[in-house]
Interface confidence: low
């Protein structure tokens, strides 16, 4: 899976969209999880309604919400009041039994609030070091990862 970069401004909301084949994933619940390290597990943050027919209802876990347009085939995750610690690698998942299919890998980047007194160009990254192939940028404030570029500079 390629990784898609979504950038948001600290303190504001960020919407992440994960398109999928609505026929292939018909009847399946979805989830948003956070990747723990390069080879680590993906820790569930929030999942859609237990009753698949009610997947359109927004479900919250803390400041993260999820809603699923099962006919159109778009899973939408909202990260409210974005904070530096929200930066990192996530996955949109389609659940079936004990299995989970990855719909999209997402790199969330948090930009400093330009109204803050810090340098408006600051970027927060998670601590792990991980490299990706290409990234398809979908957010209005966004950039592409170059092939081989390391998005998480090692922290000293």
């Amino acid at each position: 899976h390629n990784t898609t970069v979504f950038q948001g401004v600290a303190g504001q909301s960020l919407q992440v969209s994960c398109p999928y084949d609505s026929m292939k994933h018909w009847g399946r619940r979805k989830a948003w999880c956070r990747q723990l390290g390069e080879k680590g597990p993906c820790q569930r943050v929030v999942s859609t309604h237990n009753l698949w027919l009610l997947s359109f209802l927004r479900r919250w876990n803390g400041s993260t919400a999820i809603t699923d347009d099962t006919l159109g085939g778009t899973l939408t995750i909202t990260l409210r009041n974005l904070q530096p610690h929200d930066a990192g690698l996530y996955q949109c998942q389609s659940l079936h039994g004990s299995e989970a299919d990855t719909l999209r890998k997402v790199l969330v980047e948090v930009l400093a609030d330009p109204l803050d007194h810090r340098d408006a160009g600051d970027l927060w990254f998670p601590g792990e070091s991980e490299s990706f192939e290409d990234a398809h940028v979908e957010h209005s404030i966004s950039r592409s990862l170059l092939e081989g570029e390391i998005p998480f500079p090692p922290t000293s």
């Epitope: 084949d21 026929m23 292939k24 018909w26 009847g27 009753l51 698949w52 079936h96 039994g97 299995e99």
Partner: antibody
């Protein structure tokens, strides 16, 4: 009318390989999972794996992982099963079978099966 | 993998009598979406398998109403209420809740 037609069976030498075809018609091939299932003479049914032709997504039973490859050509509405390093115990009738979809949940049941093609592994 | 265990291996029933086949799974077959993907197939001699019952209790199109399915969780039953000569076949239960899909060993139904 949904139809599945397998071909490519026959006599194969031990250590050889096979490539079976499953020609599908009468439904939207690219948006239904296609399975391969086999049945050894006088034995039960054994699931090999499946493919979603729309994007090529595949799953395999662990027993066949690395030895079986399932692919699909949506322009020909055909699914394929390639198996390598064949042994006598791979002698079986091989079936392709489509997954039924029934709203509001996926049924994930195999509603249409091909007639099967016999593969005999022998020297 | 989910292991499917059928019983009995074979069954001889008089015409018009009831036939009951049991199927047990090694783990619950309830999917995360709430559905249970337990199905029954019928295979007559020299033929391909045919879908009989899907999702525990739903008869597939064209299947006579003498066939019924029941059960939940890990224990399931296929019942033929009044056995007919054309019902002589091997019956398989199968789960598709989890990958890999798995089948029971089959139950051969004959006329007594």
């Amino acid at each position: 009318e949904v139809q599945l037609l397998e071909s490519g069976g026959g006599l194969v030498q031990p250590g050889g390989s096979l490539r079976l075809s499953c020609a599908a018609s009468g439904y939207a091939f690219s948006s239904s999972w296609m399975n391969w299932v086999r049945q050894a003479p006088g034995k039960g049914l054994e699931w090999i794996g499946r493919i979603y032709p729309g994007d090529g997504d595949t799953n395999y039973a662990q027993k066949f992982q690395g030895r079986a490859t399932i692919s699909a050509d949506t322009s020909k509405n055909t699914a394929y099963l390639q198996m390598n390093s064949l042994r006598a115990e791979d002698t079986a009738v091989y079936y392709c079978a489509r997954l039924l979809r029934n709203q509001p949940g996926e049924s994930y049941a195999m509603d249409y099966w091909g007639q099967g093609t016999l593969v005999t592994v022998s020297s | 993998d989910v292991v499917m265990t059928q019983s009995p291996d074979s069954l001889a029933v008089s015409l018009g009598e009831r036939a009951t086949i049991n199927c047990r799974s090694s783990q619950s077959l309830v999917h995360s979406n709430g559905y249970t993907y337990l199905h029954w197939y019928q295979q007559k001699p020299g033929q391909s398998p045919k879908l009989l019952i899907y999702k525990v209790s739903n008869r597939f199109s064209g299947v006579p109403d003498r066939f019924s399915g029941s059960g939940s969780g890990t224990d399931f039953t296929l019942t033929i209420s009044s056995l007919q000569a054309e019902d002589v076949a091997v019956y398989y239960c199968s789960q598709s809740t989890r990958v890999p899909y798995t089948f029971g060993g089959g139950t051969k139904v004959e006329i007594k």
